[in-house]
């Protein structure tokens, strides 16, 4: 029978007895820096070309015994994950294979620079179809390991890489904290994060999400049709490698930036126990695991959103999180969450020519995230409209006044310390979508979007009582691009999108009361383009 | 790779040249850092990743790579590069003293200095 | 049900060619190795190679290299065995067998077919 | 190419007495990442094709009656049957599977004494 782990990233239209993907990813080329591997086993013999490249530190210790089949063992089983005949992911992609991890499973960064040079030379010398690169390796933090995976990115290759098996903080690992990399958590055949011996999995907002890691069947390097079952975040990467050269096969024109947002989108939601992750990283980690596409084609008409969270700004006073998008993306929204509530709010500002998401910690606070929402829209024109504090009774607002331009996301920033919670409740004038509305005292922030066909509304959900989360989801066919609470007062720890729901999330209920203060709403903004819709049919 | 950078690999003697001059000092307040990895039993210290700014041509980093050894020389170290970095990065792999960083961080088109850590497999 | 149907008895003069076959249904024929085994008159078991007919990668006994061709058409279902020139030590049953999930030993095999070379 | 050697050729068993064939390897054909032993044996009526057994030396193979059993590592296996049986009377094959080419031994009649 399908082993679980197939069976796990197969959607349910193709489940059967077997695995049996659509496309096995043959115009794909897929780079595995890893250890050495036996190219002669049955799973991966003439699939996978061994290249002259080694750069790999000596063993430690005096009496260690270079075994073969120890020394292939890694990097052959997860040679056969990602295109083995009988348990691979993508039957059809074919791979080389760079040694850079030595018998003892140990490299170097600098060796792994020097591979990731030899492939950017070797793309430059023969330039072939996709390329991706599966990284099963993690070391401490490295700028430099970082900013060479940030080139290699930017020259159209898909990196892929292990989140790390420290149980920790994947941001303090690399290659798992460049953020254009693919970096992937491992979870179990009961979706867990999976735990090995006394560490596990890595998480946290560097981890793009989850795929099978645990008692995965792969090539074994004792003989050439010996299979043994693996765990490891080097085992979950090299099936989101896979499902990423089966991806690309289909669609070779896709970018990086489309690449991500479609595993993220087809990846199953909801359903790892958080509770494994320690309590400051669950709203942080990803709760999606990876899988094929129903379909390899007709994802084009979408509107693909993904949620990116900055790195904690720390507790001093003036501090500040930036979180950013992907250079192909666009900022549809921006807000900003802080655990003990003590917050200045979020402004989207322009740095580098793009807009960024940046978050203000207030005096006394703990710190503060900035959340942007970070959209795929082609031929898109956003910009920001501002509106200072109103002082008015009324309180602030701003609309997108220019012609074709529709509201996309909301954020509010205000200079005071705290913005009262004795305010009465500020409500939107029903039939005005396209503004933004927020506390007297605060700057309010619009994020106005033209795009072929866009076209957006809002969606309120508001609880008279206090609640410590208040959500609001949009509809089928539609895209989450903005989250955020009314009013701006400070009992709201903050917004952030979850997949398609807005969350807003309040101090606990019994330090609040239950008075009319407590109220909060939820205010989603869905999107939906209908020129992606009709690009997409005309296709068909 | 080792080939490429065999012209690198002897001891630089120390004689005075234009290459050892200050005529591309670094410019003011652009000071190069040193970055280290936290988690300590992963250092590899003695070996430095020598990263270049993001316009420096393949020449410039090799010039760049035989000033340090003549600079070290000049103060009695070995030093050993042990790879020219191009195509991705700009930049060198010097086998070295840490004693050298301060030096090192000093010569033109220097934009980082990155101490060697162990990655492992997962 | 999952099975494998071969094709029928031949009879063959020396130097002759031959292509026998091997049906498979019930299953994903791509995914699952064929091997062939010989079975000469009165003897044992002998395995002479493996296809896997997802990408026709072939893996032969040293024994037989270059004495026979497997093949395999996966719009058919369909494995291949073939002779270019027949000898009459080829005179043999020979089965197709497919591969156990993730070990080539042999769940299924097919009926036989019978090939008999004589002048 | 690993050599697998049966014996005895042939075996005569009383009905209900037990049959105990060995099965020897030229090298381990155990393997220590998953303590597997790659080694299956197979049952041959007359005019039939071979029916797999018993797997990884000692797995039943679903469907196959618990008269049959196989035990063994590395390089020494038997199978054994508990209580012949009529239906049982047939050539039995051991077969190496853990690397190219896969080899069997050269069988071993049972007959009904």
């Known amino acids: 029978s399908i082993p679980w782990n197939l069976e796990r990233i197969t959607p349910p239209r193709y489940r059967a007895d077997e695995y049996q993907p659509p496309d096995g990813g043959s115009l794909v080329e897929v780079y595995l820096l890893d250890t050495s591997i036996q190219s002669d086993h049955r799973e991966i013999e003439g699939r996978v070309m061994v290249t002259d490249f080694e750069n790999v530190p000596e063993e430690d210790g005096t009496r260690f015994h270079r075994q073969a089949s120890k020394c292939d063992s890694h990097g052959t089983h997860l040679a056969g994950v990602v295109s083995g005949r009988d348990a691979g992911v993508a039957k059809g992609a074919s791979m080389r294979s760079l040694r850079v991890l030595n018998c003892q499973g140990k490299g170097t960064v600098s060796g792994t620079l020097i591979g990731l040079e030899f492939i950017r030379k070797s793309q430059l010398v023969q330039p072939v179809g996709p390329l991706v690169v599966l990284l099963p390796l993690a070391g401490g933090y490295s700028r430099v390991l970082n900013a060479a995976c940030q080139r290699l990115a930017r020259a159209g290759v898909v990196l892929v890489t292990a989140a790390g098996n420290f149980r920790d903080d994947a941001c303090l690992y690399s290659p798992a904290s460049a953020p254009e990399v693919i970096t992937v958590g491992a979870t179990n055949a009961q979706d867990q994060p999976v735990t090995l011996g006394t560490l596990g999995t890595n998480f946290g907002r560097c981890v793009d999400l989850f795929a099978p890691g645990e008692d995965i069947i792969g090539a074994s390097s004792d003989c050439s049709t010996c299979f043994v079952s693996q765990s490891g975040t080097s085992q979950a990467a090299a099936h989101v490698a896979g499902i990423a050269a089966m991806m690309l096969s289909a669609e070779p024109e896709l970018t990086l930036a489309e690449l991500r947002q479609r595993l993220i989108h087809f990846s199953a939601k909801d359903v790892i126990n958080e509770a494994w992750f320690p309590e400051d990283q669950r709203v942080l980690t990803p709760n999606l695991v990876a899988a094929l596409p129903p379909s390899t084609h007709g994802a084009g008409w979408q509107l693909f959103c993904r949620t990116v969270w900055s790195a904690h700004s720390g507790p001093t006073r003036m501090a500040t999180a930036v979180a950013r998008c992907a250079p192909d993306e666009e900022l549809l929204s921006c807000s900003s969450f802080s655990r003990s509530g003590k917050r200045r709010g979020e402004r989207m500002e322009a740095q580098g020519g793009k807009l960024v998401c940046r978050a203000h910690n207030a005096f006394g606070g703990e710190g503060v995230y900035a959340i942007a929402r970070c959209c795929l829209l082609p031929q898109a024109n956003c910009s920001v409209h501002t509106a200072p504090p109103a002082e008015a009774s009324m309180g602030t607002r701003v609309h997108c006044h220019q012609q074709g331009h529709v509201l996309t996301g909301c954020s509010s920033h205000w200079e005071v310390e705290d913005l009262g919670t004795h305010k009465p409740p500020v409500l939107r004038p029903r039939g005005q979508p396209n503004q933004c509305v927020g506390h007297r005292e605060a700057s309010i922030h619009a994020s106005c979007c033209h795009a072929p066909g866009l076209e957006c509304k809002v969606k309120e959900h508001g609880i008279p009582a206090p609640q410590e989360q208040v959500t609001v989801a949009c509809e089928e066919g539609w895209t989450l691009t903005g989250c955020s609470a009314l009013p701006g007062t400070s009992h709201v720890l903050g917004a952030y999108a979850v997949d398609n729901t807005c969350v807003v999330r309040s101090r606990d209920v019994s330090t609040t009361g239950s008075t009319s203060e407590g109220a909060v709403t939820a205010v989603a903004i869905c999107c939906r383009s209908r020129h992606l819709a009709q690009a997409s049919q005309e296709l068909q | 790779q080792e080939d490429e950078d065999g012209d690198y690999e002897e001891l630089v003697l120390a004689l005075r040249s234009e290459e050892d001059g200050l005529a591309e000092a670094p410019e003011h307040g652009t000071t190069a850092t040193f970055h280290r990895c936290a988690k300590d039993p992963w250092r590899l210290p003695g070996t430095y990743v020598v990263v270049l700014k993001e316009e420096t041509h393949l020449s410039q980093s090799e010039r760049t790579a035989r000033r340090l050894q003549a600079q070290a020389a000049r103060r009695g170290y070995l030093t050993k590069i042990l790879h020219v970095f191009h195509g991705l990065l700009p930049g060198f792999l010097v086998k070295m003293s840490g004693d050298l960083l301060e030096l090192a961080l000093k010569l033109p088109h220097v934009d980082y200095i990155e101490e060697d850590s162990s990655v492992f497999a997962q | 049900q999952v099975q494998l149907v071969q094709s029928g008895a031949e009879v063959k003069k020396p130097g002759e060619s031959l292509k026998i076959s091997c049906k498979g249904s019930?299953?994903?024929?791509?995914?699952?190795?064929i091997s062939w085994v010989r079975q000469m008159p009165g003897k044992g078991l002998e395995w002479m190679g493996i296809i896997y007919p997802g990408d026709s990668y072939t893996n032969y006994s040293p024994s037989f290299q270059g004495q026979v061709t497997i093949s395999a058409d996966k719009s058919i279902s369909t494995a291949y065995l073939q002779w270019s020139s027949l000898k009459a030590s080829d005179t043999a049953m020979y089965y197709c067998?497919?591969?156990?999930?993730?070990?080539?030993?042999?769940?299924?095999w097919g009926q036989g077919t019978l090939v008999t070379v004589s002048s | 190419d690993i050599v697998m050697t049966q014996s005895p050729d042939s075996l005569a068993v009383s009905l209900g007495e037990r049959a105990t064939i060995n099965c020897r390897s030229s090298?381990?054909?155990?393997?220590?990442?998953?303590?597997?032993?790659?080694l299956a044996w197979y049952q041959q009526k007359p005019g039939q094709p071979p029916k797999l057994l018993i797997y990884?030396?000692?797995t039943r193979e679903s469907g196959v009656p618990d008269r049959f059993s196989g035990s063994g590592s590395g390089t020494d296996f038997t199978l054994t049957i508990s209580s012949l049986q009529a239906e049982d009377v047939a050539v039995y094959y051991c077969q190496q599977y853990s690397s190219f080419p896969i080899t069997f031994g050269q069988g071993t009649k049972v007959e009904i004494k």
């Open positions: 990884w030396a000692s």
């Open positions: 090298q381990s054909v155990l393997y220590s990442s998953n303590n597997k032993n790659y």
């Open positions: 067998a497919r591969d156990y999930a993730y070990k080539p030993l042999f769940d299924i």
């Open positions: 019930g299953y994903s024929f791509t995914n699952y190795w």
